[in-house]
Interface confidence: low
């Protein structure tokens, strides 16, 4: 399907002008290639009428032009002094007329209505309000005032000053007669319907002295605004319906093949399941305006959308509406990224979020979509630091890998973390994307102790176990803070051949803090990555307490000189809080690493990554 998009139908009246906007993917080639407007003939050929290279056909000379806006990926064709002969089928396109990079446009030019002399024309959108002004002479001031609608040769009474109201106008029409001295009465019609369209006659008095005034009421369906967005991107519909419906329920609906309108979302809590996790209705301003954001755009989201107001939260005739025609461009600049990321309870996920690479300095955000009522998306984390307290120690936003992608890591997963999350920036809003996190059955691949209490001034060593499948990955420990996770200095992992034949159930990377200080308290993450692409993480909280003087019991670590393949019976013993703690779930069937605690020089915090059979008695 062609990625060029424009209005399907354009209608106007003889003598008027039209402006036709066509959209194209703003690639470098497209921006500079020829743009054209051509008319389809009986033979099927499309004859150029105007092009971006300066050509204008004789038929269009002096009344048409084509302007390219390469930075927006649009071009506009203006045609003035329209005649009935201009009605027909056209194409706006790129390149060669016959190439297919085009969009079909139907132009209909109709004859203006024949109106009686002195007719006042009122042009109003459907659902809005019109005030028809009816002048009269002094002698008719005390006499009956009325408004009629002309239907063919007959006149049907709509309203009069004797309290008659035509049933078709019940509850939406009023006749106002001013005080003395003002020689004009007005008829106000609210919530205009398409059927209200037509010629009206104001009348004051009767007989030959009566005052009459013709009014032509043109009720228009709103012209849909064309919206051209990229596949996987985001669209925002801004809906401003006016103060008169500020307190009425609002909705966005999509026109279906039966020409009815299916509610997509409304302020009464209804939401189409096809938009679950990727739609928000932003709360309305005082003036009643609101906006609807849809992310993760799909080709099937294309179509005509209407926003409106009605107490039922759905489209009803005679209520104000706004319209859009959405086209989803499949030649998207937004890269593919997983829309579903799976993690296990207790494990972690690393989510890749795309952003406009031209906006590398923009602030990056991650929010949790909440479906309640109109939906909301409270920020959980941003590139300048953590936002939500309850995510402390388990959420981080990283600028890596960069160049149009950032990473969000969430660990200590529970079933409550399942849901939809949005990636966004304070820059280009079209790059908002949605990812669903699913919690599946399984065990975390990385295993760390539950809670660790370190003692001031002593050495602390925390093991992190990982399976063989991660042997080729880079392992790291980092200290979490609300501005990121600061990688701790890593030690040499040893010869690469150590990772070639991985027949162990698991390996470990250990963190050593020596000596422990008050500043060491906090969350630490063990993780794996490949280059700038992050994998799984596991978190552990380290509490720091004063050294106990009396009555403390020391449990020595497992013997360091155990033979390489010898399983140590008491493999659940860990040196934490100077107490023996059994944790068979974590350490059973795994070889124990001994750590004498004293570091031979090196940095105070260090990471040691090695297979268990290669580790010696002291930390490297």
């Amino acid at each position: 399907k062609s990625p060029v998009f424009g209005p399907q139908e354009v209608s106007s009246v003889e003598g008027n002008s039209v402006s036709i906007k066509c959209y194209y993917p703003p690639t470098s080639v497209n921006r500079h290639t020829r743009k054209y407007w051509c008319r389809k003939g009986a033979s099927g050929r499309c004859i150029t009428l105007v092009s971006s290279e300066g050509y204008v056909s004789s038929n269009y000379a002096g009344r048409a032009n084509l302007t390219n806006f390469p930075e927006n990926g649009t071009f506009v064709v203006n045609i003035a002094q329209l005649s009935r002969d201009d009605s027909g089928h056209y194409k706006c396109g790129l390149g060669i007329n016959s190439r297919g990079l085009s969009f079909d446009v139907s132009l209909e030019v109709s004859q203006g209505p024949e109106l009686p002399n002195g007719t006042e024309v009122y042009t109003v959108d459907v659902g809005r309000t019109v005030t028809i002004k009816c002048p009269f002479k002094t002698e008719n001031a005390p006499k009956t005032k009325a408004l009629y609608k002309k239907i063919g040769q007959t006149s049907v009474l709509v309203i009069d000053s004797r309290n008659y109201v035509n049933p078709n106008y019940k509850d939406r029409i009023r006749l106002r007669i001013p005080g003395t001295g003002q020689l004009i009465f007005t008829v106000v019609i609210d919530r205009l319907r398409l059927s209200d369209h037509g010629l009206y006659l104001c009348q004051a008095g009767d007989g030959s002295n009566r005052d009459e005034k013709n009014a032509d009421l043109q009720v228009l369906e709103p012209e849909p605004e064309l919206v051209y967005e990229d596949l996987r991107g985001s669209v925002t519909f801004h809906c401003a319906l006016g103060l008169e419906v500020a307190n009425v329920a609002k909705f966005l609906c999509r026109v279906n093949s039966r020409e009815t309108c299916d509610v997509v979302i409304n302020t009464l809590g209804k939401r189409d399941s096809a938009f679950e996790g990727r739609i928000l209705l932003n709360p309305q301003d005082k003036d009643g305006s609101f906006s609807v954001v849809i992310t993760g755009l799909r080709k099937e989201d294309e179509g005509r959308y209407l926003c409106g107001a009605h107490s039922d939260g759905q489209l009803q005739e005679g209520w104000p509406i706004q319209a859009w025609q959405l086209f989803v461009n499949e030649e998207s600049t937004i890269p593919r990224s997983p829309t579903v990321v799976k993690g296990v309870a207790g494990g972690s996920v690393a989510v890749l979020c795309p952003y406009n690479p031209k906006e590398s300095q923009s602030l990056k955000y991650w929010c949790l979509w909440e479906g309640a009522q109109n939906g909301r998306c409270p920020l959980l984390v941003e590139s300048q630091g953590l936002v939500q307290e309850q995510y402390e120690g388990r959420l981080s936003l990283l600028q890596e890998p960069g160049n149009g992608t950032f990473t969000v890591i969430l660990n200590q997963l529970t079933t409550q973390d399942a849901g939809f999350y949005w990636c966004l920036t304070n820059g280009d809003t079209r790059w908002r994307t949605t990812v669903e996190i699913k919690i599946i059955e399984g065990e975390p691949n990385l295993k760390v102790p539950g809670n660790v209490t370190a003692v001031l001034g002593e050495t602390l060593n925390i093991p992190c176990h990982f399976p063989c499948k991660f042997s080729s990955y880079e392992k790291y420990w980092c200290k979490w803070s609300n501005t990121g996770c600061q990688t701790l200095p890593s030690q040499d992992e040893g010869p690469s051949e150590a990772f070639v034949n991985c027949d162990e159930n698991s390996r470990l990377v250990s963190l050593t803090l020596n000596p422990v200080t008050r500043a060491d308290e906090g969350w630490y993450w063990c993780g794996v990555k490949q280059g700038h692409f992050y994998g799984e993480t596991a978190a552990v909280y380290v509490a720091v307490e004063e050294k106990k003087v009396a009555g403390s019991r020391y449990v020595s670590p497992a013997k360091a000189d155990a033979a390489p393949d010898e399983k140590v019976l008491d493999s659940g013993v860990r040196e934490i809080e100077n107490k023996a703690i059994q944790d068979p779930r974590l350490f059973a069937e795994e070889k124990v690493v001994a750590d004498t605690g004293d570091q031979a020089g090196g940095s105070r915090a260090s990471v040691d990554s090695s297979s268990s059979e290669e580790q010696g008695g002291s930390s490297k």
Partner: nanobody
């Protein structure tokens, strides 16, 4: 449709304690997406705000008249919210209502969208 059912009301002496519970059921969305609050209405008076709690229990807010005496908590696992009332006074006599909302704000103007039927608390002197 959402149902909120209060329990735990009764007749107590001034200075005593009482614990009110509110159980939620029939929600389209899980309990932990709703902010919750307690209100009360004394005979012949308007309904007044007592206390509220955010959907995750992270923040609470109390009316000045109950601050330091009442504590609101929630158990999202059991879909319940509790109001612990200590040092009760005769002025605390009222029908106590549980309410839910789709967002929380501090202050006494809690944006309630569903209400319970109420439970009567009578404090005698």
């Amino acid at each position: 449709q959402v149902q909120l059912v209060e329990s735990g009301g009764g007749l107590v002496q001034a200075g005593d304690s009482l614990r009110l519970s509110c159980a939620a059921s029939g929600r389209a969305l899980s309990f932990n997406t709703y902010a919750m609050a307690w209100f009360r209405q004394a005979p012949g008076k308007e309904r007044e705000f007592v206390a509220s709690i955010t959907y995750n229990g992270g923040s609470t807010y109390y009316a000045d008249s109950v601050k330091g005496r009442f504590t609101v908590t929630r158990d999202n696992g059991k879909d319940t919210v509790t109001l612990r009332m200590n040092s009760l006074k005769p002025d605390d006599t009222a029908v106590y209502y549980c309410a839910s909302a789709q967002y929380w704000r501090s202050g006494t103007s809690f944006p309630a969208n569903y209400w319970g039927q109420g439970t009567l608390v009578t404090v005698s002197s």
